[in-house]
């Protein structure tokens, strides 16, 4: 199940690439399987949130992203992930590209990764 | 009802190892939903935490880092316990220990305790 | 680390009376935050955690409110029971420090 997640979020990280025009060469951080989450690419000084996973729910591979993204002028709308929200992650785009998660995943969703066992 | 009891010396010479145990009953060490802690109390430092041990199909330790270096958890799945060792203690570990459970629900907190250890460091 | 202040160090208080303990934080820390209250030679109890949600057999007299850095408890209709230290405790990194205390004794 874990493996079909990373798939489905190597899937949206590159549908995410194309919409904002991301190559390899672009500057900025690109998006990434964490082993817990999923993270779009995102402009040098940009936060990016996520909510904590559901640990065995599926990705939709044509779902939109769980994340929003915080640059300077985007504060996201009313419906968006909030940094007051108890089970939201986020990570930093910096010129040496991600941040570690703050709060980190263990603190922020009393997990810190995927169990191998059930 | 969960419940910790608490055992080890009262009297630790400086540079020795302060060890005590933890004794769980009401849950388990292995409980995937919990955490398993240990603070300290003085009147210099109030109280302080020093890390925790939890099983989440592995086991998994973090360490404050003001005693990374001198500090091991370890669980003992056999006998649903679990022990603090600190190591080289100088007079300032002098303290009241407790050993506490971690519980999840929106963040992590110590929802039951040991009934404390005073340890006094000293020659 | 995340340093967390109290305040009053201590009050003075009488049976009835109600009383508020605030509690702030070096950084932005949302709601994860707990209350502990201690009695002499004994471990502390926890009484609140993620910032408002009351534990289980906490009487409904205590309640806690705030987000950010900024976080009160309240006592409402202060009973012989409740003199003790009350901490505050971050809980959203690791290593999860607690606030110095304020003793509350009677007037």
């Known amino acids: 199940i874990f493996k079909k997640e990373q798939a489905m979020c190597l899937e949206k990280i590159q549908r995410a690439n194309e919409l904002m025009g991301f190559n390899d060469s672009s500057p900025g951080c690109p998006g990434m399987w964490d082993n817990i989450t999923c993270w779009k690419p995102a402009h040098v000084g940009e936060m990016v949130l996520v909510s904590c996973p559901e640990l065995f729910r599926i990705f939709n591979p044509d779902q939109v992203w769980e994340t929003e993204t915080i640059g300077e002028s985007d504060f996201g709308d009313s419906n968006s992930l909030d940094l007051s929200d108890m089970g939201v992650v986020s990570r930093n785009c910096t010129e040496d590209g991600w941040s570690e998660p703050f709060p980190h995943y263990f603190d922020a969703c009393g997990f810190d990764e995927y169990e191998s066992e059930t | 009802q969960v419940q910790l009891q608490q055992s080890g010396p009262g009297l630790v010479k400086p540079s020795q190892t302060l060890s005590l145990t933890c004794a769980i009953s009401?849950?388990?060490?292995?409980?995937?939903?919990?955490?398993w802690n240990w603070i300290r109390q003085s009147p210099s430092r109030g109280l302080e935490w020093l890390g925790r041990t939890y099983y989440r199909g592995k086991w998994k330790n973090h360490y404050a880092v003001s005693v990374k270096s001198r500090i091991t958890i370890n669980p003992d799945t056999s006998k649903s316990q679990f022990s603090l060792q600190l190591n080289s203690v100088t007079p300032e570990d002098t303290a009241v220990y407790y050993c506490?459970?971690?519980?999840?629900?929106?963040?992590?907190?110590?929802?039951?305790w040991g009934q404390g250890t005073l340890v006094t460091v000293s020659s | 680390d995340i340093q967390m202040t109290q305040s009053p160090s201590s009050l003075s208080a009488s049976v009835g009376d109600r009383i508020t303990i605030t509690c702030r934080a070096s950084?932005?820390?949302?709601?994860?935050l707990n209350w502990y209250q201690q009695k002499p030679g004994k471990a502390p109890k926890l009484l609140i955690y993620a910032s408002y949600n009351l534990q289980s057999g906490i009487p409904s007299r205590f309640s806690g409110s705030g987000s950010g850095t900024d976080f009160t408890l309240t006592i409402n209709s202060l009973q012989p029971e409740d003199f003790a230290t009350y901490f505050c405790?971050?809980?959203?990194?690791?290593?999860?420090?607690f606030g110095p205390g304020t003793k509350v004794d009677i007037k």
């Open positions: 950084q932005y820390i949302v709601r994860y």
């Open positions: 009401g849950d388990s060490v292995s409980n995937r939903l919990a955490t």
């Open positions: 405790q971050q809980a959203i990194m690791a290593p999860y420090t």
């Open positions: 506490a459970r971690g519980t999840w629900n929106q963040d992590w907190f110590l929802d039951h």
